[in-house]
Amino acid sequence: KFSKQSWGLENEALIVRCPRQGKPSYTVDWYYSQTNKSIPTQERNRVFASGQLLKFLPAAVADSGIYTCIVRSPTFNRTGYANVTIYKKQSDCNVPDYLMYSTVSGSEKNSKIYCPTIDLYNWTAPLEWFKNCQALQGSRYRAHKSFLVIDNVMTEDAGDYTCKFIHNENGANYSVTATRSFTVKDEQGFSLFPVIGAPAQNEIKEVEIGKNANLTCSACFGKGTQFLAAVLWQLNGTKITDFGEPRIQQEEGQNQSFSNGLACLDMVLRIADVKEEDLLLQYDCLALNLHGLRRHTVRLSRKNPIDHHS
């Protein structure tokens, strides 16, 4: 569970984060699992530990193995495992599957390809980007912060994209490369101002105190893959996660459906054990995309349980 795969190329920098988190003040000890040997913290070592991070500057094939990190909290020692594999550099242009990060998809409008793991490194812009080993040139390609933007994506843009950057550690520079596949969804789509199908504006939903209630926010955004589209719930103008009532939760993930060819999203708000104070809240279904934001407000009202008379 608290184990993470990491990989890199020999003679490049590799930085691995402990799969267990912790406060910055917590001590983190790293060990090479096979020998139980402690990883030094002195930066003069090629492989050294720096708090939550394990640094290979640069990495060698022989560094491959499982590393144990122990985060020492005031109450428990929490253990994580980093499974590190360092590969030899390929002589040809093909990047093997085992060096690939997760695939990303884009559509014809424009697409972002994030450089994987870059947030772990001390790097400075610009990033260099390559597709199938060729440096990317032309106005359609824009290296922006930690991602590549491709304008007017075409099916021919599918392929393997490699980002290359320099990690700086105490004045020394180390090269890092990371590759991921990019696929293009070939659909003639369009984007509209969001249309909320449910709930109706200013809808009053009847609920029973002490029972569970579900509210569904459903909206459509156009046809085909949407570059940016989201539906979410707010309580009294606050994000559900920030509102902090554990009884009220959004359903994990957004369900995507294609209704009459339209791209639609829905988000279910689950209210457990409805309480009187829930009736005082304002529930906002928000749908947003590049065109703008639409909001429908719902309020709850008490549904009196039906009395059964003989």
Epitope: Q21, G22, K23, S25, S73, P74, T75, F76, P246
Partner: antibody, heavy 121, light 106 residues
Framework: QVQLVQSGAEVKKPGASVKVSCKAS????????MYWVRQAPGQGLEWMGA????????AFNQKFKGRVTMTRDTSTSTVYMELSSLRSEDTAVYYC??????????????WGQGTMVTVSS | DIQMTQSPSSLSASVGDRVTITCSAS?????MHWYQQKPGKAPKLLIY???KLASGVPSRFSGSGSGTDFTFTISSLQPEDIATYYC?????????FGQGTKLEIK
């Protein structure tokens, strides 16, 4: 949603033991350590100890070491706190609690409803 | 053990008042958490990591401080804020709480 449901009130004689249960739901039981806090009538809060349901590892307030045992049953997502050699000053409400983000120890965001334990001859 | 000393032990204030509770630790701590407890109820987390507002907690509650001295503030007291408030450190074993501050309405 996260819920911690504790066992009912207990009345015990001095010298006896009491075992309080705390059944967790709404999250992956083994992902979060469970803590025990007690509160004597009209008094403040006192941390007793904790258990990691994944490993069974425990951490205790030295004040209770030797008298308190914490166990878990992963099949029922339940943790238990047993306090032995009870004395009258152990009369208190016993709470189980867990943090919002386990690894970051960011305060006890979730609490059981409490179990009143009365020690009286 | 790190002793936590809250002051005052009790205080009386009027609705709309700014209320401040302090918590002093016998040794330096990295973070402080604050709880509200109403009679017969389990404590409720209000502030974690010294100054972060717990989920769903009104913004009139705030926290600050570092080292050994920490402060909890209610910017404008509301009737529903009547409760006992506790500070808690999670920097060393055993975890310890302040003795509590009982807040009443004038």
């Amino acid at each position: 949603q996260v819920q911690l449901v504790q066992s009912g009130a207990e009345v015990k004689k001095p010298g006896a033991s009491v075992k309080v249960s705390c059944k967790a739901s709404g999250y992956t039981f083994t992902d979060s350590e469970m803590y025990w806090v007690r509160q004597a009538p009209g008094q403040g809060l006192e941390w007793m100890g904790a258990i990691d349901p994944e490993t069974g590892d425990t951490a205790f307030n030295q004040k209770f070491k030797g008298r308190v045992t914490m166990t878990r049953d992963t099949s029922t997502s339940t943790v238990y706190m047993e306090l032995s050699s009870l004395r009258s000053e152990d009369t208190a409400v016993y709470y189980c609690a867990r943090a919002f983000d386990n690894d970051n120890d960011d305060g006890f965001a979730y609490w059981g409803q409490g179990t009143m334990v009365t020690v009286s001859s | 053990d790190i002793q936590m000393t809250q002051s005052p032990s009790s205080l009386s204030a009027s609705v709309g008042d700014r209320v401040t509770i302090t918590c002093s630790a016998s040794s330096s701590v990295n973070y402080m958490h604050w709880y509200q407890q109403k009679p017969g109820k389990a404590p409720k987390l209000l502030i974690y990591d010294t100054s972060k507002l717990a989920s769903g907690v009104p913004s009139r509650f705030s926290g600050s401080g570092s080292g050994t001295d920490f402060t909890f503030t209610i910017s404008s007291l509301q009737p529903e804020d009547i409760a006992t408030y506790y500070c808690q450190q999670w920097s060393s074993n055993p975890l310890t709480f302040g003795q509590g501050t009982k807040l009443e309405i004038k």
